[in-house]
């Protein structure tokens, strides 16, 4: 599923991401835009043999299990396929674990380089939330 901007903002808010660990909703929507272009089925294979999955491009070496990544830690204790669902519950729950893990949203490279320090509230402007 490819979410609309405001549709995703509403879903993320329902799942408790607004101000989770101090990050406003705009940060999460911005991260999703530049990680996956709001596409829940986005996958990207990396040259280290791992794959990034879903709307927040969560990595199979560390956070989920796809059955093909050697040394997978599966720290979110989920199959990577769950991160491709149109229901973003699994992605959000895993993202909450990642963002709580000491490095905040710096864990998402796209957020660091495209969202951090910008007017992220623009990503939810005009949305009925």
């Amino acid at each position: 599923k490819v979410f609309g901007r405001c549709e995703l903002a509403a879903a993320m808010k329902r799942h408790g991401l607004d101000n989770y660990r101090g990050y406003s909703l705009g940060n999460w929507v911005c991260a999703a835009k530049f990680e996956s272009n709001f596409n829940t089925q986005a996958t990207n294979r990396n040259t280290d043999g791992s794959t990034d999955y879903g709307i927040l491009q969560i990595n199979s070496r560390w956070w989920c299990n796809d059955g093909r990544t050697p040394g997978s830690r599966n720290l979110c204790n989920i199959p990577c396929s769950a991160l491709l669902s149109s229901d973003i519950t699994a992605s959000v729950n895993c993202a909450k674990k990642i963002v709580s893990d000491g490095n905040g949203m710096n864990a998402w490279v796209a957020w660091r380089n495209r969202c951090k320090g910008t007017d992220v509230q623009a990503w939810i402007r005009g949305c009925r939330l």
């Epitope: 990396n46 040259t47 280290d48 990595n59 070496r61 560390w62 830690r73 720290l75 990642i98 893990d101 000491g102 490095n103 710096n106 864990a107 490279v109 660091r112 380089n113």
Partner: nanobody
Framework: QVQLVESGGGLVQAGGSLRLSCAAS????????VGWFRQAPGKEREFVAA????????SYADSVKGRFTISRDNAKNTVYLQMNSLKPEDTAVYYC??????????????WGQGTQVTVSS
């Protein structure tokens, strides 16, 4: 352009130890995800160990768990692989890789040229 340079390989007897180093050089970058693969003659490249910036988590191949330890020195942009209780089957070329994040820019995976580790029986 970031370069990864491995060092520390060599010839060691079974049961011995080596410490590999992988230093990243360049400017305006940070190391996000970094680790080691190895390739023995006639075999495919295989994962050995990795560590990630977030949470400092580590990951190991089953074949090296309890014998190898990966660590990193962020100030020096260097990752280490301490290899203890080495076995002849650990003989391979060891390659470092790193996911490099450029300041205000994209990320890329880089690979080193490799360092030979030979374990004699």
């Amino acid at each position: 352009q970031v370069q990864l340079v491995e060092s520390g390989g060599g010839l060691v007897q079974a049961g011995g130890s080596l410490r590999l180093s992988c230093a990243a050089s360049g400017s305006s970058f940070s190391i996000y995800d970094v680790g080691w693969f190895r390739q023995a003659p006639g075999k495919e490249r295989e994962f050995v160990a990795a560590t990630i910036e977030t949470g400092g988590h580590t990951s190991y191949a089953d074949s090296v768990k309890g014998r190898f330890t990966i660590s990193r020195d962020n100030a020096k942009n260097t990752v280490y692989l301490q290899m203890n209780s080495l076995k002849p089957e650990d003989t391979a070329v060891y390659y470092c890789y790193a996911k490099i994040v450029y300041d205000q820019g994209p990320s890329y995976y880089y690979w080193g040229q490799g360092t030979q580790v030979t374990v004699s029986s």
